[in-house]
């Protein structure tokens, strides 16, 4: 074998070795990158786990706090349950009375029955303070509301449900005051004015009962 051939073989072998070296370096670099990426992912996962653990811990504390608050509220409710509110739910408290504005439209007699079923009577106005309160309460409504005032015919006086007469200084009844109806004439209040009408017709109503003002 000639020297030139040996030289060629050596050059070829060197080229192969260089290629393999580069290949190996590439593989090592890729493995290093993969390891670094893996390490990064691992670190991220660790961070995530730590964050979740911290949040879980916070939530557990919050839950514990809420549980204590709930127990305190239950205790408070038990104490409050022993003290009665002046008026039932949905009723409006004013002075010595509770008032309920009906959500249905009925004739006077049916309205009276509805109030009685709630252990109440139809609205009775005893004073100018009562009248002012009712006028204020219904001022934003255009609906007519039956009150507990009626009379058999124009020759009879206006009477409240308890049989007491209407005090003339409180208000003047207008409308069908000179009419006689088989069911009688009843009074309703609308935007603060009081009108007479046939009791058989439908209107909303206001129920009234004494407020529970006893000290416990």
């Amino acid at each position: 074998m000639q020297l030139s051939q040996v030289s060629d073989l050596l050059t070829q072998e060197q080229a192969n070795l260089t290629h393999q070296k580069k290949k190996l370096e590439g593989q090592i670099s890729a493995r290093q990158q993969a390891e670094e990426a893996s390490q990064e992912s691992e670190n991220e996962l660790k961070e995530m786990i730590e964050t979740l653990a911290r949040k879980l811990n916070e939530k557990s504390k919050e839950q514990m706090e809420l549980h204590h608050q709930n127990l305190n509220l239950q205790e408070t409710l038990k104490r409050v349950a022993n003290c009665s509110a002046p008026c039932p739910q949905d009723w409006i408290w004013h002075g010595e009375n509770c008032y309920l504005f009906s959500s249905g439209s009925f004739n006077w007699e049916k309205s009276q029955e509805k109030c009685l079923s709630l252990d109440a009577k139809l609205l009775k106005i005893n004073s100018t303070a009562d009248l002012d309160f009712i006028q204020q309460a219904i001022s934003y409504s255009s609906f007519p509301f039956w009150m507990g005032l009626s009379r058999r015919n124009p020759s009879y006086p206006w009477l409240w449900e308890d049989g007491s007469p209407l005090m003339p200084h409180l208000f003047r009844v207008r409308g069908a005051v000179s009419q006689t109806y088989p069911s009688g004439t009843c009074a309703y209040i609308q935007r603060g004015a009081v009108y007479a009408e046939n009791c058989i017709l439908a209107a909303f109503s206001i129920c009234q009962k004494k407020a529970n003002l006893r000290a416990q």
């Epitope: 006028q135 255009s142 007519p144 207008r174 409308g175 069908a176 009419q179 109806y181 309703y188 609308q190 935007r191 603060g192 004015a193 009108y195 007479a196 009408e197 046939n198 017709l201 439908a202 209107a203």
Partner: nanobody
Framework: EVQLVESGGGLVQPGGSLRLSCAAY????????MGWYRQPPGNQRELVAV???????NYAESVKGRFTISRDNAKNTVSLQMNSLKPEDTAVYYC???????????????WGQGTQVTVSS
Amino acid sequence: EVQLVESGGGLVQPGGSLRLSCAAYGSFFSIGTMGWYRQPPGNQRELVAVTYGLGSTNYAESVKGRFTISRDNAKNTVSLQMNSLKPEDTAVYYCYAEIDTDPRSGEWDYWGQGTQVTVSS
């Protein structure tokens, strides 16, 4: 200020029909009675028909069965449908309303300016 504005009067032959309308304008809380009165020539003002707040009505005996009163609470209007008109229905017809302008005020009765109805052949 409250105003009642009437429309619909005129000349009509006996047996004919007319419709009167009246609208309340101005600032007020509520309206109780609304209706119609009339004043025949040389006579006193008399009730024709009224409608109360919840819808009951009252008519003069002489117009029962011929006249019909109706009311629109949302528009604050009242109408009078007059059928089978007779010469004795000739009069100035006035719209009337019982209006609450202020619960503490004494003024309640409001009248329109009147509209002439003449029944003649």
